[in-house]
Interface confidence: medium
């Protein structure tokens, strides 16, 4: 079994599917957000382009007792070829700029989007 | 209250068309991604078609692209899948869904296709 976002699906999920289920996972937390996401916490900002997946994770990893995130972290994991442990660091972050996490979720989705529009799922 | 409310299933012979709409109301309908999703009898919930909330932008899945249309207006609350070139594997209930694919927190009741000769 293939373990995706914390559902369980007979055999490997396509690209297509995974990242539909992120961009999902990604809808909800933006749509059902009432309290400051993650009670404001601050994550180092991203360039979106190629690794951005490992680069995203590599930032939501540092913001911990975030229930509302968490399954996204999971979903992320999926994404990234290296394990990803808190406290790294990717030439991808820019430097020096930090962002509310419910901004960050924002930017990714409207990413995430344009890549699903594009048939970019990998 | 959220309410979704599908309209314009019927019979439909292989290779024409129907037109679905979906009368959204209790929710600011602009601002919210939407989708269609489908349930062929005997199988579970298919992801059709989303469109974004702001854009649009459209989505759809590999076996309606090209032939399946997802539009919205804002104006009357009201959310449209136009399709074309109907198969019969396209039998199915379709549900109307506020939010993506089927990360969805409201549906309605369906409206019922068949495609057949």
């Known amino acids: 079994l293939t373990c995706l976002g914390g559902f369980a699906s007979p055999g490997p999920v396509p690209p297509s599917t995974a990242l539909r289920e992120l961009i999902e996972e990604l809808v909800n937390i933006t749509q059902n957000q009432k309290a400051p996401l993650c009670n404001g916490s601050m994550v180092w900002s991203i360039n979106l382009t190629a690794g951005m997946y490992c680069a995203a994770l590599e930032s939501l990893i540092n913001v911990s007792g975030c229930s509302a995130i968490e399954k996204t972290q999971r979903m992320l994991s999926g994404f990234c070829p290296h394990k990803v442990s808190a406290g790294q660091f990717s030439s991808l972050h820019v430097r020096d700029t930090k962002i509310e996490v419910a901004q960050f979720v924002k930017d990714l989705l409207l990413h995430l989007k344009k890549l699903f529009r594009e048939g970019q799922f990998n | 209250e959220v309410q979704l409310l599908e309209s314009g299933g019927g019979l439909v012979q292989p290779g024409g068309s129907l037109r679905l709409s979906c009368a959204a109301s209790?929710?600011?309908?602009?601002?919210?991604?939407m989708s269609w999703v489908r349930q062929a009898p005997g199988k579970g919930l298919e992801w059709v078609s989303s469109?974004?909330?702001?854009?649009?932008?459209?989505y759809y899945a590999d076996s309606v692209k090209g032939r399946f249309t997802i539009s919205r207006d804002n104006s009357k609350n009201t959310l449209y899948l136009q399709m074309n070139s109907l198969r019969a594997e396209d039998t199915a209930v379709y549900y109307c869904?506020?939010?993506f694919g089927l990360g969805f927190d409201y549906w309605g009741q369906g409206t019922l296709v068949t495609v057949s000769s």
């Open positions: 869904a506020k939010g």
């Open positions: 209790g929710f600011t309908f602009g601002g919210y991604d």
């Open positions: 469109i974004d909330g702001v854009g649009p932008h459209t």
